[in-house]
């Protein structure tokens, strides 16, 4: 059976995925290639918005936001004026750590 993960080994915590008459590895963050044996750059997918710079840390990715943006992925504009707007904050992951 071609569509079978039983004999397929995926390295570095990757998981075998069946489908379309074939099987492949779905790799953990930071790994790639057919069997997840190659180092991959998780920042290559450009996970930060609005020109934020991506950095890979041991605990996960981090975005350093361009001036005027905030949020874990720099998704929110910072608007110091207006009641309905976001509070002013320095660039980066401010304000606060959103993890709960």
């Amino acid at each position: 059976d071609l569509d079978d993960c039983a004999g397929r080994a995926c390295a570095n915590g990757g998981t075998c995925v069946e489908g379309g008459g074939a099987h492949r590895c779905s790799c953990a963050l930071g790994f790639g290639g057919r069997d997840c044996r190659e180092r991959a750059d998780p920042c290559a997918a450009r996970p930060c918005a609005h020109g934020g710079r991506c950095y890979a840390h041991f605990s996960g990715l981090v975005c350093a936001c361009a001036p005027g943006y905030m949020g874990a992925r720099c998704e929110f504009p910072v608007h110091p004026d207006g009641a309905s707007a976001l509070p002013a904050a320095p660039p980066g992951l401010r304000p606060g750590d959103p993890q709960r």
């Epitope: 779905s26 918005a49 609005h50 998704e75 929110f76 750590d97 709960r100």
Partner: antibody, heavy 124, light 113 residues
Framework: QEQLVESGGGLVQPGGSLKLSCKVS????????VSWVRQAPGKGLEWIGY????????YYASWVNGRFTISSHNAQNTLYLQLNSLTAADTATYFC?????????????????WGPGTLVTVSS | DVVMTQTPASVEAAVGGTVTINCQAS??????LSWYQQKPGQPPKLLIY???TLASGVPSRFKGSGSGTQFTLTISDLECADAATYYC???????????????FGGGTEVVVK
Amino acid sequence: QEQLVESGGGLVQPGGSLKLSCKVSGFDFSNYGVSWVRQAPGKGLEWIGYIDPAFGRTYYASWVNGRFTISSHNAQNTLYLQLNSLTAADTATYFCVRVALVVAGVAYYGMDVWGPGTLVTVSS
Amino acid sequence: DVVMTQTPASVEAAVGGTVTINCQASQNIYSYLSWYQQKPGQPPKLLIYRTSTLASGVPSRFKGSGSGTQFTLTISDLECADAATYYCQSYYYSSGSSYGAFAFGGGTEVVVK
């Protein structure tokens, strides 16, 4: 092909707990997160929370109040929703949903791939 | 928390007609507004994200517009297959907890005659 499949639903007594699973495949967590959304019978959609595995972050709706916990395991291909202190008001279909967060530098924050859902019934 | 108010709760229109659904956010959500279609017994389906961008495979009869706090979904040239419940969804900055959160509108049932 992108896919999410929930499991673990069923009948549970008031005050009880349940752990739902979501098996995901076919996409890269650099750009996507996974959200849990529920829908009571005949009612609208209610967001519970989401996990952004690449950033190691978990976010919850304010009403969750610590009763529910989202986690991931096994190279981030299986996600979980732990439900505690359940009441009849928690009876719903629970959906596991892919969230397009930031793709190629563009922020989307739309829920683009939905699982079929798993029904949780809280009753004595 | 942001409250998404969807109007009307129900709307009826003839085949070939046009339906407009409104969604109002209680605070500025910028362009982070998505629309979903749900038919009985099925999970919702993404129609539009970022206010006006059509999801893959969605016909151009569906049009999203708006910004800030006021948003609209317009369905033109109505077909029987458009009979469904439609939901708006926002992504917003939650100042109380300092992170992003999602919220859904209450839904609009579209009946096609």
